[in-house]
Interface confidence: medium
């Protein structure tokens, strides 16, 4: 079953807001003047990271020697992070004695850069997407997904890891961003808000969507994630916004119906294989792309983000199930598990379609402020 589509011909923001056309250029604040993040109404603005030491690139990540075994993502400084996990934060938590097991918490101190210096990098994720400022790149071809329609067996591991719900994917799910840019899917997870509060990580014109799915991929140039961390294009994430629609989404229901089983932090269950591509929008040709980072520590940069223009529709009940079932650290609900949007710092978001073209009658000429940087790729 294909997923319901948002308005096919309007860039993101138009379909979700009910408007027939996207915002005109005159409605946009300049990048320099805009706040670091546009929070949904009622959400406290978070302290900025502008005064933190910038970090252009993540230091090279080298595996441990063979004698020591491979590098683990959890080999990060030990920190204590009390605080209210109900508020979205750029902060993390790592249990003091949890040698190789780390637990990220949204909320509390210290700032993430103290946990992983890369979190203070200049090219972080998520970001606010402004279609009018995106560079149209005809070289960005439709995404290619192979092997995403999984049989029921073997079953897949669905886990509440304390900061999201994560589905571990088996080998064989291949994705290509373009010729020679081939990846293997590793896992998918979701970000969400709370009752009446949206929780997507990326925003569009400052608009936050109810939720967001991330499918994390490893470049075929690398054998292991630790080798790819911080390397340009080492990891790629497909991201799609989840919105409220009139009907139940049967693909998502296969996962959402199992959340009660993993309500506790650290719990997991096995779910039959499913069509992973059915969790994504059906239009693989229209998307935004930029280079950013992981949105949780270690915040490694060099991650290629592909954010679909089309959204995925879930019923109101399904969105409520997602945001109101799971529990995180410290007997707190697992909610609002998104990072604040990060400054672009000169990055240009590219679009595979003319997202900056205003189709409304008042636009005499297409507006396209940035040129494509990847035309020759």
């Amino acid at each position: 079953q294909r997923l319901p589509r948002m308005q096919e011909d309007s860039p993101l923001g138009g379909g979700s807001s009910g408007e027939d056309d996207p915002l005109g250029e005159e409605d946009l604040p300049s990048e320099e003047d805009s706040p670091r993040e546009e929070d949904p109404p009622g959400e406290e603005d978070l302290p900025g990271e502008e005064d933190l030491p910038g970090e252009e690139d993540l230091p090279e990540v080298k595996p441990k020697s063979e004698e020591e075994g491979s590098l683990k993502l959890e080999d990060l400084p030990t920190v204590e992070a009390p605080g209210d996990p109900q508020e979205p934060q750029n902060n993390a938590h790592r249990d003091k004695e949890g040698d190789d097991q780390s637990h990220w918490r949204y909320g509390g101190d210290p700032p993430w850069p103290r946990v992983s210096p890369a979190c203070a990098g200049r090219f972080q994720s998520p970001v606010d997407i402004r279609p009018q400022l995106a560079a149209f790149c005809p070289a960005l071809r439709p995404l290619e997904l192979l092997g995403f329609q999984l049989p029921p067996l073997p079953e897949l591991r669905l886990r509440n890891n304390g900061h999201s719900v994560q589905l571990t994917l088996p080998p064989g799910l291949e994705m290509a961003l373009g010729p020679g840019r081939e990846y293997r899917a590793l896992q998918l997870h979701l970000h969400w808000g709370a009752a009446g509060r949206p929780g997507s990580e990326h925003t569009v014109e400052g608009h936050r969507f109810p939720a967001e799915i991330h499918v994390v991929h490893l470049s075929t140039a690398f054998a292991r994630v630790d080798e790819a961390l911080g390397r340009p294009g080492g990891l790629a994430v497909l991201a799609a916004f989840l919105e409220e629609g009139p009907e139940e989404n049967s693909a998502y229901e296969q996962l959402l119906s199992r959340l009660e089983e993993i309500a506790e932090e650290g719990s997991e269950t096995q779910v039959p294989g499913l069509d992973i591509s059915a969790l994504l929008p059906s239009d693989f040709s229209r998307y935004f792309q930029y280079e950013g980072s992981l949105t949780t520590p270690p915040c490694a940069q060099g991650v290629i983000w592909t954010v679909f223009n089309q959204t995925v529709m879930l019923s109101a009940k399904q969105l409520h199930t997602l945001s109101d079932t799971l529990w995180g650290p410290g007997d707190s609900r697992l909610q609002l598990n998104f990072r604040a949007t990060q400054p672009l710092n000169g990055r240009v978001i590219e679009a595979s379609f003319p997202a900056g073209v205003d189709s409304s009658p008042r636009a005499a000429e297409p507006v396209q402020l940035n040129s494509c940087l990847a035309a020759g790729d």
């Epitope: 249990d95 004695e97 190789d100 097991q101 886990r159 896992q187 932090e265 719990s267």
Partner: antibody, heavy 124, light 107 residues
Framework: QVQLQESGPGLVKPSETLSLTCTVS????????WSWIRQPPGKGLEWIGY???????NYNPSLKSRVTISVDTSKNQFSLKLSSVTAADTAVYYC??????????????????WGQGTTVTVSS | DIQMTQSPSSVSASVGDRVTITCRAS??????LAWYQQKPGKAPKLLIY???SLQSGVPSRFSGSGSGTDFTLTISSLQPEDFATYYC?????????FGPGTKVDIK
């Protein structure tokens, strides 16, 4: 350095409940999975089940109806109860730390720390 | 349940020999496989995790390979302290299951 120590009676009567405790020293029980494994005399290893520090459990279906694993984080201990035992439950019982990554991608690091094992004989 | 089989069930070898033990899963388990060494009267010891990653403190003569259903543990040059029983274990699906073991003894 994390160490595990099993404790409990070495002899249990048939139809009774076997109770064992594993004490974690040199580190915290938090943020890990903790497994029980057994090994009948002269045979291989059988996973009984595990518990996460938050209290969530997963059991071997072959033993699920008889097994309860619990955790006491304040004492840095986790426990095994196996009800309605028979002679087939005679084995060396081990506790172990089981490392499943809870980072942004799944990774399995194996059972890296084991107790020395305790022999439990089921006999009248 | 995923069944794990090992071959050979036992192997006689001499110090300095190269020893290879294979483990096969009844269905694909990605790379979620660990290898353990157990000596009589002792608890198992983790050697390899994630199919090919060497556990800290384990000599580099031990190596693991494989993915999917077929895996191999290799001891490049057998040492006197390596005579033991070796078990593989999968962590792809519940219940976690072990292979029946391979006993490496002195020829």
């Amino acid at each position: 350095q994390v160490q595990l120590q099993e404790s409990g009676p070495g002899l249990v009567k048939p139809s009774e409940t076997l109770s064992l405790t594993c004490t974690v020293s040199g580190g915290s029980i938090s943020s890990y999975y903790w497994s029980w494994i057994r090994q009948p005399p002269g045979k291989g290893l059988e996973w009984i089940g595990y518990i996460y520090s938050s209290g969530s459990t997963n059991y071997n279906p072959s033993l699920k109806s008889r097994v309860t694993i619990s955790v006491d984080t304040s004492k840095n201990q986790f426990s095994l109860k196996l009800s309605s035992v028979t002679a087939a439950d005679t084995a060396v019982y081990y506790c172990a730390r089981d490392q499943h990554s809870s980072s942004f991608y799944y990774y399995y690091y194996g059972m890296d720390v084991w107790g020395q094992g305790t022999t439990v004989t089921v006999s009248s | 349940d995923i069944q794990m089989t090992q071959s050979p069930s036992s192997v006689s070898a001499s110090v300095g020999d190269r020893v290879t033990i294979t483990c096969r899963a009844s269905q694909g388990i990605s790379s979620w496989l660990a290898w353990y060494q157990q000596k009589p009267g002792k608890a198992p010891k983790l050697l390899i995790y994630a199919a090919s990653s060497l556990q800290s403190g384990v000599p580099s003569r031990f190596s693991g390979s494989g993915s999917g259903t077929d895996f191999t543990l290799t001891i490049s040059s057998l040492q006197p302290e390596d005579f033991a029983t070796y078990y593989c274990q999968q962590a792809n699906s519940f219940p976690l299951t072990f292979g029946p073991g391979t006993k490496v003894d002195i020829k």
